[in-house]
């Protein structure tokens, strides 16, 4: 059975939306098959407002009878998608998603794109080929991601709060050095949480807290000078880079694409 | 186990024609597109065309168009090539090949008919 | 047509040598995430022997010091270390659309 190792190239297209797609690692695959390919399933993370395009297995059109896109997402019915050679004709079953369609003509790609990538592509994708002696398939569990919006403000003294806005999945925030802390988590009907981290400094010694925000699209790191005033409520949005506001300045070092590297601290 | 076993070798004169047999065992004949493939001496090998005996579908490298002609015959698990209007640059050793479905590759291969042409 | 050029056509090399064969293509071979690019090995009168398919992928039964890499135009076959019963033709090959060979590249002992 294939070694489930993952490429995922991306590039810029005209349209400035990212595009990705996502096939099979050629490095990995250590394919000892008989008459019929192991079901193989990867699951796939990809930003929301990019496109996407899911493969087949490489086989020949000239081995295939069907090729068949099985498309379950939540709360509807599967839509299938289904080319057969023979008649050169392409069918669709319960599918109302006009952004989800066959790259080019069936007959001359198989593969299936998405664009863009909205939160209800959340789901399983599965490309179905149908030869004379078996079937091949390919599976993908879609995890859609949105970037999360971070804020990071002082409330009180010796008090800030860290806020990772409408994240998919959760994002993670930590702080350097630890403090007293205490997160909530607040879910959304579209999937999306926010997640809420506030911490206070006892020690007085402490002058400039950073809050890290690790997310599958990327980290987000910000800092902000405690204020010894009672009251003062400062706040700056993240996103842009070495913002500045008229009581102190915000250092934001955005990394993109660093999901594989986070770092979890559970805080209290 | 699947083996591919070529008719022997033959000598032909110029403008005759020659039919090289494939018989097919230990898989369903019908199941995988059959190759053909040369080699003449020193060279490069050369791609003929392909059958599909599934659906008698078949396609050849337009050198050949024309002169080659792909068949089959399902109920004896055998595809044949046969060469017209043959010369003497057509001496080379043909092999019947079977596409496995991933990846397009040949793992199983005929053991080769060489076709000589002389006068 | 796609044309596959390999490089170098013949080479000398002894018994625990590495040995480098490279193919370029006229165009990529590379679609939907594979590359169709496969390697044989050839011994007089005997038929090719399949020893990497997809570019990168070890066919069952064939030695580790075998590898494949690249994509798109340009591709590699490694033997690590060469054996004895490593002296043969080596050829490129791809298999989309249309099928086509590289020329050969004939692995002599030094």
């Known amino acids: 059975q294939p070694n489930n190792s993952l490429m995922l190239q991306t590039s810029k297209e005209n349209h400035a939306l990212a595009s990705s797609s996502l096939c099979m690692d050629e490095k990995q695959i250590t394919q000892n098959y008989s008459k019929v390919l192991a079901e193989v399933n990867t699951s796939w993370p990809v930003k929301m407002a990019t496109n996407a395009v899911l493969c087949c297995p490489p086989i020949a059109l000239r081995n295939l009878i069907i090729i068949t896109w099985e498309i379950i997402l939540r709360g509807q019915p599967s839509c299938t998608k289904a080319y057969r050679k023979e008649t050169n004709e392409t069918k669709e079953t319960n599918c109302t998603d006009e952004r989800i369609t066959w790259v080019s003509r069936p007959d001359q790609n198989s593969d299936l794109q998405i664009r863009p990538v909205a939160i209800t592509h959340d789901g399983y994708y599965r490309c179905i080929m149908v030869t004379p002696d078996g079937n091949f398939h390919r599976g993908y569990h879609l995890q859609v991601l949105v970037t999360p919006e971070v804020t990071l403000f002082q409330n009180r003294n010796r008090t800030a709060v860290c806020k990772a806005v409408a994240g998919k999945p959760a994002a993670q925030i930590s702080w350097i050095p630890e403090g007293d802390c205490a997160t909530k988590q607040e879910y959304w009907s579209n999937g999306t949480v926010t997640v809420k981290s506030t911490c206070h400094w006892e020690v007085h010694n402490v002058s400039t807290v950073t809050c890290h925000v690790s997310h599958l699209t990327g980290n987000k790191s910000l800092y902000i000078e405690l204020l010894p005033v009672p009251g003062a409520k400062k706040s700056a949005k993240g996103g842009g880079s070495g913002l500045n506001d008229i009581f102190e300045a915000q250092k934001i070092e955005w990394h993109e694409g660093s999901g594989g590297h986070h770092h979890h601290h559970h805080h209290h | 186990e699947v083996q591919l076993v070529q008719s022997g070798a033959e000598v032909k004169k110029p403008g005759a024609s020659v039919k090289v047999s494939c018989k097919a065992s230990?898989?369903?004949?019908?199941?995988?597109?059959m190759f053909w493939v040369r080699q003449a001496p020193g060279q490069r090998l050369e791609w003929i065309g392909y059958?599909?005996?599934?659906?008698?579908?078949?396609k050849y490298n337009e050198k050949f168009k024309g002169r080659a002609t792909l068949t089959s015959d399902k109920s004896a698990s055998t595809a044949y090539m046969e060469l017209s209007s043959l010369r003497s640059e057509d001496t080379a050793v043909y092999y019947c090949?079977?596409?496995?479905?991933?990846?397009?590759?040949?793992?199983?291969w005929g053991q080769g008919t060489l076709v000589t042409v002389s006068s | 047509d796609i044309q596959l050029t390999q490089s170098p056509s013949s080479l000398s090399a002894s018994v625990g040598d590495r040995v480098t064969i490279t193919c370029r293509a006229s165009?990529?071979?590379?679609?939907?995430?594979?590359?169709?690019m496969h390697w044989y090995q050839q011994k007089p009168g005997k038929p090719p022997k399949l020893l990497i398919y997809?570019?990168?992928n070890l066919e069952s039964g064939v030695p580790s010091r075998f590898s494949g890499s690249g994509s798109g135009t340009d591709f590699t076959l490694t033997i690590s270390s060469l054996q004895p019963e490593d002296f043969a033709t080596y050829y490129c090959?791809?298999?989309?659309?249309?099928?086509?060979f590289g020329g050969g590249t004939k692995v002599e002992i030094k």
């Open positions: 090949a079977r596409e496995d479905y991933y990846g397009s590759r040949f793992v199983y």
């Open positions: 230990g898989y369903t004949f019908t199941s995988y597109v």
């Open positions: 059958i599909n005996p599934y659906n008698d579908d078949t």
């Open positions: 165009k990529s071979v590379s679609t939907s995430g594979y590359s169709y």
């Open positions: 997809l570019a990168s």
């Open positions: 090959q791809h298999n989309r659309e249309l099928l086509t």
